[in-house]
């Protein structure tokens, strides 16, 4: 392209050095905070995700700032302020620290922020070939339509009574719960 260091191609205080081979007439050595072949791009220091626990990163040029989510503090939002303090999870759920917000790990059959909503493990229709799904407290249970078997009713039963079970794991029977 014919551009040389004499043309001042390095921006933002970059140091121009003459190229060692004919294909690169110059090389820019960029100062901290800048990148690109001509030091024209500001380095996005937030791309390194320095703010922990979901904090919002702000690059102020001269410094980085983290805006922390509720429940966290510190220059990099690294301090957990115990978001479970005073929080209750219903129906046997347990509060889990982290994530910046009160979070419940719910017992089987319950869901929602505070485990107050009934969760239906059958909603995804896990029982194949028209099998019926039941939300038993021990886990979902499938009752297969006639002609099918397996924990999820995935295997057809042949007319002679044998099934198309490919080397079934021990104890696999119709209706075994999926925990």
């Amino acid at each position: 392209s014919g551009v040389t260091c004499a043309d001042g191609p390095c921006f933002n205080g970059g140091l121009c050095v003459g190229g060692a081979d004919p294909d690169s007439a110059y090389i820019c050595h960029c100062p901290p905070g800048f990148q690109g072949s001509n030091c024209e791009k500001r380095v996005d220091r937030c791309s390194l995700q320095p703010c922990r626990n979901g904090g919002l990163c702000l690059d102020l040029g001269h410094a980085l700032r983290c805006r922390c989510r509720a429940g966290f503090a510190g220059p990099r939002c690294e301090h957990d302020l115990d978001d479970c303090a005073g929080r209750a999870c219903a129906n046997g759920g347990t509060c889990v620290e982290g994530g910046g917000a009160h979070r419940c790990s719910c017992a089987l059959g319950f869901g929602g922020r505070d485990c107050r909503e009934r969760a239906d493990p059958c909603a995804a229709r896990p029982c194949a070939h028209g099998g019926r799904c039941y939300a038993h407290f021990s886990g979902l249970v499938c009752a297969c339509a006639p002609g099918y078997m397996g924990a999820r009713c995935e295997f057809p039963v042949h007319p002679d009574g044998a099934s198309a079970l490919p080397a079934a794991p021990p104890g696999l029977r119709p209706g075994d719960p999926q925990r």
């Epitope: 009934r118 239906d120 059958c122 019926r132 799904c133 039941y134 939300a135 038993h136 407290f137 021990s138 979902l140 249970v141 009752a143 297969c144 006639p146 029977r173 119709p174 209706g175 075994d176 719960p177």
Partner: antibody
């Protein structure tokens, strides 16, 4: 507290009709259950009548109950049993019961008495 | 599908053992979808055992279920006065069919 309560029982004449209602509290039929009707004649054992699977609304009946009994879901918390051409032999306590898996009834209502007599 | 219970009635002394048998004309679903209930006058049946041998929550451990396929047994070890009741077996069959046994009355003296 999960509960079932039956209503609609009473005295009915032979060949008459009656509709029983099962009302759930503490849970709703948005989850998948068999909501069933079981009857028990005085001094006899329980007898399964019919179920409705709340997952897709499909129904199942004892062979003797087909035609005269109809189970349906009236709302997210109520199930009904319509009975027609009632006979003296249909006199019994009618229970609403829930199957939550493994084919057993883990939750029962207190029952409602149906008396068929002239 | 017919479930036959034997014997009835059955009598036991307090602290004794009661054994009730339940036989099905065909295999229950999954070979073990059979349950046992206790019923007292004026009350609905109360489940004791499900899936042939699983004790329902809150049921005393003196109640034990066993068996598979078509033959099942309920055993009460160390019978109490409060165990005097009628006991029913109930099966679930392929095709979404339910059936109850005829019942066994247990007298505890």
């Amino acid at each position: 507290q999960e509960q079932l309560v039956e209503s609609g029982g009473g005295l009915v004449q032979p060949e008459g009709s009656l509709t029983l209602t099962c009302t759930a509290s503490g849970f709703s039929f948005s989850s998948s259950y068999d909501m069933c009707w079981v009857r028990q004649a005085p001094g006899k054992g329980p007898e399964w009548i019919a179920c409705i699977y709340t997952g897709d609304g499909s129904t199942d009946y004892a062979s003797w109950a087909k035609g005269r009994f109809t189970v349906s879901k009236a709302s997210s918390t109520t199930v009904t049993l319509q009975m027609t051409s009632l006979a003296v032999a249909d006199t019994a306590t009618y229970f609403c019961a829930r199957n939550s898996g493994y084919g057993y009834f883990g939750l029962w209502g207190p029952g409602t008495l149906v008396t068929v007599s002239s | 599908q017919v479930l036959t219970q034997t014997p009835s009635p059955v009598s036991a002394a307090v602290g004794g053992t009661v054994t009730i048998s339940c036989q099905s004309t065909e295999s229950v679903y999954g070979s073990d979808w059979l349950s046992w209930y206790q019923q007292k006058p004026g009350q609905p049946p109360k489940v004791l055992i499900y899936q042939a041998s699983n004790l329902e929550i809150g049921v005393p451990s003196r109640f034990k279920g066993s068996g598979s396929g078509t033959q099942f047994t309920l055993t009460i070890s160390g019978a109490q006065c409060d165990d005097a009741a009628t006991y029913y077996c109930q099966g679930y069959y392929s095709g979404y069919i339910y059936a109850f046994g005829g019942g066994t009355e247990v007298v505890v003296k």
